[in-house]
């Protein structure tokens, strides 16, 4: 392990943190939990405690940002630099910044929470098997109502566990319509819309009317983000896959690697690639926010990079489902803060 010059560290043990903003890649509750679990790794082996607060005078301010984001260290777009953190100290020192040009996940693909179905709100499992085919995004296959769904296990055919994916046909968010689903088509400024739109807004948020005529009823909601089918790169970055789509005369109802030599999954963002040529890459496995946060929080606590490849503080991202902390990480953080105190022994009680 290595520490920063002068063994920079916090001189109090009750560390506070503030989550200043969020990535849209994950539900807020999942982000909150990822950060809490990342801090818990370090508190489990030291006398440190971590308390979430809601003000900027927190010791560790957590922020998602892209490119130039308010410090002297701009991010670099997708991949490359995933995040950075400042060593302990006042002000920006100790803060942790995450590059929101990354796809943040829990390391195993986009996290799509489900509603209804029979899986108690479990997240989608990508890819999943349905009727012998592999799906890497929510699908409407097998349904006549157009509602996108997913399996919450690897194989729907054997496990029969599913839920409905976020969809404007199921519900909307915020707005003034109590979460009612979109009504398609709807009229807005005299024009007919059969999909969510950003028209009339400067913030880029997709919305829809929840009645047939917005001009008359003024009822609307925001359309849920579809992380599973929001494309990256190609010529339609940020747009949604359209399923089914036609490619070389064949219909596809999930992302495909057909036509590519590198195996990367892609989709069309209109119903016909052959005529429109609009496409993008489907989401990849993403980076585990939990693992990257745990690494960054190590820096925010005073640990430099480790030369041990298996250590959490090694400077290369590596997805693991095992215990993230290596003995080298534990030795490093204990060098700065000491071990977690043993609970006071209790005298035996007599009855």
């Amino acid at each position: 392990f290595q520490t920063f010059e002068g063994d920079l560290k916090w001189h109090h043990h009750n560390i506070t943190y503030w989550i200043q903003n969020y990535s849209e890649d994950l539900p807020r509750a999942v982000i909150d939990d990822a950060f809490a679990r990342a801090f818990a790794l370090w508190s489990a082996v030291t006398p440190l405690t971590f308390t979430r607060v809601y003000s900027r005078d927190a010791d560790i301010v957590i922020q998602f940002g892209v490119a130039e984001h308010g410090d002297g260290y701009p991010f670099d777009g997708k991949d490359g630099l995933l995040a950075h953190a400042f060593p302990p100290g006042p002000g920006i020192q100790g803060d942790a910044h995450f590059d929101d040009d990354e796809l943040w996940s829990l390391g195993k693909g986009v996290v799509v929470p489900t509603r209804f179905g029979n899986a108690d709100g479990a997240a989608c499992h990508f890819p999943f098997i349905f009727e012998g085919r592999s799906y890497s995004a929510c699908t409407t296959d097998g349904r006549s109502d157009g509602l996108p769904w997913c399996s919450t296990t690897a194989n729907y055919d054997t496990d029969d566990r599913f839920g409905f994916c976020p969809s404007e046909r199921l519900y909307t968010q915020d707005g003034n319509a109590d979460g009612k689903p979109c009504q398609f088509p709807f009229i807005f400024q005299g024009q007919s819309y059969s999909a969510c739109t950003t028209d009339g807004r400067s913030d880029g948020y997709r919305w829809c009317a929840t009645t047939a005529n917005y001009d008359r009823d003024k009822l609307f909601g925001f359309c849920p983000t579809r992380a599973d089918s929001t494309v990256m790169g190609g010529n339609s970055a940020g747009e949604l896959c359209v399923f089914p789509f036609t490619f070389l005369g064949k219909e596809y109802s999930t992302c495909t690697s057909e036509g590519r030599g590198d195996g990367r999954l892609w989709c069309a963002t209109t119903s016909n690639f052959d005529s429109d040529k609009k496409w993008g890459f489907c989401p990849d496995q993403g980076y585990s926010l939990f693992l990257v946060a745990a690494h960054e929080f190590g820096h925010a606590l005073g640990l430099d990079h480790s030369s041990v490849p298996e250590a959490l503080m090694y400077p290369m991202y590596r997805f693991t489902e095992g215990p993230p902390l290596h003995k080298d990480d534990v030795n490093g953080i204990r060098h700065l803060y000491g071990p977690r105190p043993e609970p006071e022994p209790r005298p035996p009680t007599t009855t």
Epitope: D76, L82, D304
Partner: antibody, heavy 123, light 107 residues
Framework: EVQLLESGGGLVQPGGSLRLSCAAS???????DMWWVRQAPGKGLEWVS????????FYADSVKGRFTISRDNSKNTLYLQMNSLRAEDTAVYYC?????????????????WGQGTLVTVSS | EIVLTQSPATLSLSPGERATLSCRAS??????LAWYQQKPGQAPRLLIY???YRATGIPARFSGSGSGTDFTLTISSLEPEDFAVYYC?????????FGQGTRLEIK
């Protein structure tokens, strides 16, 4: 021993082009942010451009759209392609190495600099 | 863009004297400040980074202090080889910027 050696400077007419090179040795070039900094005759230092290990680039407003920074990690070499040169681009151009790398950040400074190469833009 | 103002522009002192150079930032830059020394015909040399840490091989007579907007480079007892131009540089906000320099000359 860390070394940075610039080359490619010279006299060029306004509107012309030059390509500067900086050969690096003595450190793991591919891991570090690399910078170009210039100094007009008798003046102070001015940053020009930086390139991250990932290839992401940033430029000073004064050169944006005219200069292109690049790197060849297999050759341990940093480049600066300068087009549409102006009289005010006349300077000694230095390449410099960031002292630190990676995702922990402090202002660590440029710990190694090349000897500089003079670019003169004049008709 | 953060402006760094160095003072004085020129400092005339004798060997053995103490030199105090100032660098003021137009807004807070925490401790993201470096100091460089440049002699005629040479490239700059890193003296101090993170406001107060001496770079490798820099003699102990050089020290840096300050945080926020006000920073100081101190040379406790001037040696003949210390007479040069000194620049401060910030990375508290993007883009990085340099001060205009302080010329330290022999009195």
């Amino acid at each position: 021993e860390v070394q940075l050696l610039e080359s490619g400077g010279g006299l060029v007419q306004p509107g012309g082009s030059l390509r500067l090179s900086c050969a690096a040795s003595g450190f793991t070039f591919s891991q570090y942010d690399m910078w170009w900094v210039r100094q007009a005759p008798g003046k102070g230092l001015e940053w020009v451009s930086v390139i991250y290990p990932s290839g992401t680039t940033f430029y000073a407003d004064s050169v944006k759209g005219r200069f292109t920074i690049s790197r060849d990690n297999s050759k341990n070499t940093l480049y600066l392609q300068m087009n549409s040169l102006r009289a005010e681009d006349t300077a000694v151009y230095y390449c410099a190495k960031d002292r630190a790398y990676g995702d922990y950040v402090g202002w660590n400074g440029f710990d190694y600099w090349g000897q500089g190469t003079l670019v003169t833009v004049s008709s | 863009e953060i402006v760094l103002t160095q003072s004085p522009a020129t400092l005339s002192l004798s060997p053995g004297e103490r030199a105090t150079l100032s660098c003021r930032a137009s807004q807070s830059i925490s401790s993201f400040l470096a100091w460089y020394q440049q002699k005629p015909g040479q490239a700059p040399r890193l003296l101090i980074y993170d406001a107060s840490y001496r770079a490798t091989g820099i003699p102990a007579r050089f020290s840096g202090s300050g945080s926020g907007t006000d920073f100081t480079l101190t040379i406790s007892s001037l040696e003949p080889e210390d007479f040069a131009v000194y620049y401060c540089q910030q990375r508290g906000n993007w883009p990085i910027t340099f001060g205009q320099g302080t010329r330290l000359e022999i009195k």
